[in-house]
C-alpha cells in the first residue's frame, strides 16, 4: 500500500496528526524533497555571516562572509578573518611571514620559498613575503655569450629573520 505521505511535495510536510494531509512549511523553514514528515528550520546568516541566497520553502538559505572575512568549512560553516598578502593568521592575529616564507593570498599560511637549487636551477627573481622565488634556467644553461643577463645573487635559504 502506498504511503499517503509520498504525495506531499517539497515545501510541505506530511502531518501525522491531521490524517497525513500535506501542510505547507511555515515561514523560515523548508523541505527540499517530497514525502517529508518535518520541515527543516532555515539557516540564519547573522553576525559576520551575510545572506548569499534567501531561504525558500524548498531550499535552505546560503551564507557567505562579510568583507574582511572568508568562508571555511562545508557550506561556509565558519568565517575566518582575512589577512594581507605577506601575512598569516595566528592566535594573536595577522603576523608577517617569516623570512624565507611567503603568502600570496589573504588566507592560509606562509609557505617556504621554492628551493631552486633542488631542481638544479638558479634564482631569477628573489622571493618576498608576498611572492615566491622565480627560478630560472640552470647555471649550466647560461653558456657564455648566450645571454647578457648577469644571474642575480641566490636567495637566502628559508629561515627566520632576527626578532
Amino acid at each position: 500500500l502506498q504511503d499517503p505521505c509520498s504525495n506531499c511535495p517539497a515545501g510541505t510536510f506530511c502531518d501525522n496528526n491531521r490524517n497525513q494531509i500535506c501542510s505547507p512549511c511555515p515561514p523560515n523553514s523548508f523541505s527540499s524533497a517530497g514525502g517529508q514528515r518535518t520541515c527543516d528550520i532555515c539557516r540564519q546568516c547573522k553576525g559576520v555571516f551575510r545572506t548569499r541566497k534567501e531561504c525558500s520553502s524548498t531550499s535552505n538559505a546560503e551564507c557567505d562572509c562579510t568583507p574582511g572575512f572568508h568562508c571555511l568549512g562545508a557550506g561556509c560553516s565558519m568565517c575566518e578573518q582575512d589577512c594581507k598578502q605577506g601575512q598569516e593568521l595566528t592566535k594573536k592575529g595577522c603576523k608577517d611571514c617569516c623570512f624565507g616564507t611567503f603568502n600570496d593570498q589573504k588566507r592560509g599560511i606562509c609557505r617556504p620559498w621554492t628551493n631552486c637549487s633542488l631542481d638544479g636551477k638558479s634564482v631569477l627573481v628573489n622571493g618576498t613575503k608576498e611572492r615566491d622565488v622565480v627560478c630560472g634556467p640552470s647555471p649550466a644553461d647560461l653558456s657564455p655569450g648566450a645571454s647578457s643577463v648577469t644571474p642575480p645573487a641566490p636567495a637566502r635559504e628559508p629561515g627566520h629573520s632576527p626578532q
Epitope: 501525522n16 515561514p27 514528515r37
Partner: nanobody, 120 residues
Framework: EVQLLESGGGLVQPGGSLRLSCAAS????????VGWFRQAPGKERQYVGT??????HYGDFENNRFTISRDNSKNTLYLQMNSLRAEDTAVYYC???????????????QGQGTLVTVSS
C-alpha cells in the same frame, strides 16, 4: 551547552489553568523550533506541540485547550493550559529542535521537566 529550565508546574483542580514557562540559557531560541512533550506516570512520552515563526502545531489530544507561545526577547517559551483534566497529569518537558513539527523527531535539547498534577 544549551540548558532549558521549566517552571510553573504544580497542583491544580480540574477545570483550572496553568502557564508553564521554559527559559533557555547558553543559546538563544532564535534559530530553533520550540515545543513541549509530556509523560504521564507509567505511560509513553506524548507530543504536545511545536512553535515556529508564528505557527503552532499541536498533538491530536489537546482540543484547543493548550496554547504555545514564545518571547524571543526573554528567551522564554510558554505553554498555556486551560480546562485541565486529571488525564493531563504528567511531567511536562520543554524542547527545541531544528525540525518543525517535533511530533515524529527526537529534539536536539530537552529540559528536566516540571510536574503538573490535576486533582481535586
Amino acid at each position: 551547552e544549551v540548558q532549558l529550565l521549566e517552571s510553573g508546574g504544580g497542583l491544580v483542580q480540574p477545570g483550572g489553568s496553568l502557564r508553564l514557562s521554559c527559559a533557555a540559557s547558553g543559546r538563544t531560541f532564535d534559530n530553533y523550533a520550540v515545543g513541549w512533550f509530556r509523560q504521564a506516570p507509567g505511560k509513553e512520552r506524548q507530543y504536545v506541540g511545536t512553535y515556529w515563526s508564528g505557527y503552532a502545531h499541536y498533538g491530536d489530544f489537546e482540543n484547543n485547550r493548550f496554547t504555545i507561545s514564545r518571547d524571543n526577547s526573554k528567551n522564554t517559551l510558554y505553554l498555556q493550559m486551560n480546562s485541565l483534566r486529571a488525564e493531563d497529569t504528567a511531567v511536562y518537558y520543554c524542547a527545541i529542535s531544528l525540525k518543525y513539527p517535533m511530533a515524529t523527531v527526537t529534539p536536539d535539547y530537552q529540559g528536566q521537566g516540571t510536574l503538573v498534577t490535576v486533582s481535586s
